[in-house]
């Protein structure tokens, strides 16, 4: 529940990219279970793919959506499926790959004066006077109007890391997701555990920057498993 999420102090893991090494800057922060973007972390490689169970689209990666693997299949068993490319059939925006949205049951390009909820700086900066646009950001719906090209700066609301400027990733912060700085060498990071609990996550750190990976700090090897400190270190 939201209550347990927001009362948790847990800082859990961030996923490595598809088929990549943990900490590669190309990876995005996955949504975590909880208030607005429920979900968990996942790890998958091309040669050892394991379907990731999900309940909502936000639990899946940027190029995936959550659905039953078979038409008319058990609604209780849903996994992350590869997004639908342009001109493929769809039922909702999340089914279409980034840069596209679902229109009349077909994935079409977002560059036709539409925007698939990939919030960018111009929108967060167009909050509007005195409640005119709330936070200038629609969480689940398509944003229609003109196209926006400026990437989100640190602190901007986002949906995914591609919404953020270089050196930033999209990470959870309480009831929202905002652009946060990618971690530098020596900064504390959160080590992803491939198996086990997809614990609650209300405050996410970004992944480690290029050339860095999240590893246990050498002088903490003797520490108990639960208190091991991980930092971004050179490969």
């Amino acid at each position: 529940t939201l209550n347990s999420v927001l009362n948790s102090n847990a800082i859990k893991n961030l996923p490595p990219p598809l088929g990549g090494a943990a900490g590669h800057p190309g990876s995005a922060v996955s949504a975590a279970p909880g208030i607005l973007y429920p979900g968990g972390n996942k790890y998958q490689t091309i040669d050892n793919y394991q379907p990731y169970p999900c309940a909502e689209d936000e639990e899946c990666g940027t190029d995936e959506y959550c659905a039953s693997p078979t038409r008319g299949g058990d609604a209780g068993v849903q996994i992350c499926l590869a997004c639908r490319k342009r001109r493929k059939r769809c039922m909702r925006h999340a089914m279409c790959c980034p840069g596209n949205y679902c229109k009349n049951g077909i994935c079409v390009s977002s560059d036709q004066n539409h925007f698939r909820g990939e919030i960018e700086e111009t929108i967060t900066e167009s909050f509007g006077n005195d409640h005119s646009t709330l936070d200038g950001y629609s969480r689940r719906t398509t944003l229609s109007s003109k196209m926006y090209h400026t990437k989100g700066q640190e602190g901007s609301v986002c949906l995914r890391s591609s919404d953020c400027a270089s050196g930033l990733c999209c990470a959870r912060h309480f009831w929202s997701k905002i652009c946060k700085p990618v971690l530098k060498e020596g900064q504390v990071c959160t080590k992803h555990r491939r198996k086990g609990s997809h614990g609650l996550e209300i405050f996410q750190r970004c992944y480690c920057g290029e050339g860095l990976s999240c590893r246990i700090q050498k002088d903490h090897h003797q520490a108990s498993n639960s208190s091991r400190l991980h930092t971004c270190q050179r490969h």
């Epitope: 939201l2 208030i35 607005l36 409640h131 709330l134 689940r140 609301v157 912060h173 309480f174 929202s176």
Partner: antibody
């Protein structure tokens, strides 16, 4: 244009409960979290709790745990905050605030709740 | 809970003056600091979020700076309509907490 309109002032006796409403318009109600913040006379603002209208999930400030209940009625785009076991120190202006980011951008006009015997 | 302490509690300044309010957090809150303006009988209004980002429609004479535990809110040239109480708010750790406020008056 986003608008949050709250119910009118209330006068309550100690031990009673109060339920304040906040009707939202100008946006899709289920797409933003609704927070409740109170301000006692001459005091600082105090966050009470939050609800996600899309699924009813809530979180409360531990200070009010057990006394505050936040609910929503999606059909009328209205959020409610109920505070029970009222005491004199609960006399305050209660605000609803709708937001997506970790800040409060949109506020209701406030509802004064007076607790007096 | 994280305690937020503002100083001064009140201040008097003349139109055109540069006004500075400080906010200190009881622990490191990184950049997770917002500033609000509240006029008597009105709801607070968001001015600055994430330490220094100006909310839309807010005049550029308002600015924010700082990091960690010490933050500063500045009005570069005080205007008559700026008379209000200003609050800082941390959103680093739940529950979000506010400073006690700084009441700004015109000399």
């Amino acid at each position: 244009q986003v608008q949050l309109v709250q119910s009118g002032a209330e006068v309550k006796k100690p031990g009673a409960s109060v339920k304040v409403s906040c009707k939202a318009s100008g946006y899709t109600f289920t797409e933003y979290t609704m927070h409740w913040v109170r301000q006692a006379p001459g005091q600082r603002l105090e966050w009470m709790g939050v609800i996600d209208p899309s699924n009813g999930d809530t979180s409360y400030n531990q200070k009010f745990k057990g006394r505050v209940t936040i609910t929503v009625d999606k059909s009328s785009s209205t959020a409610y905050m109920e505070l029970s076991s009222l005491r004199s120190e609960d006399t305050a202006v209660y605000y609803c605030s709708s937001t997506t980011g970790p800040w409060f951008a949109s506020w209701g006009q406030g509802t004064l709740v007076t607790v007096s015997s | 809970d994280i305690q937020m302490t503002q100083s001064p509690s009140s201040l008097s300044a003349s139109v055109g003056d540069r006004v500075t309010i400080t906010c200190r957090a009881s622990q490191d809150i990184s950049n997770y600091l917002n500033w609000y303006q509240q006029k008597p009988g009105k709801a607070p209004k968001l001015l600055i979020y994430y330490k220094s980002r100006l909310h839309s429609g807010v005049p550029s004479r308002f600015s924010g700076s700082g990091s960690g535990t010490d933050f500063t809110f500045t009005i570069s040239s005080l205007q008559p309509e700026d008379i209000a109480t200003y609050y800082c708010q941390q959103v680093h750790t739940l529950p979000p907490t506010f400073g006690q406020g700084t009441k700004l008056e015109i000399k």
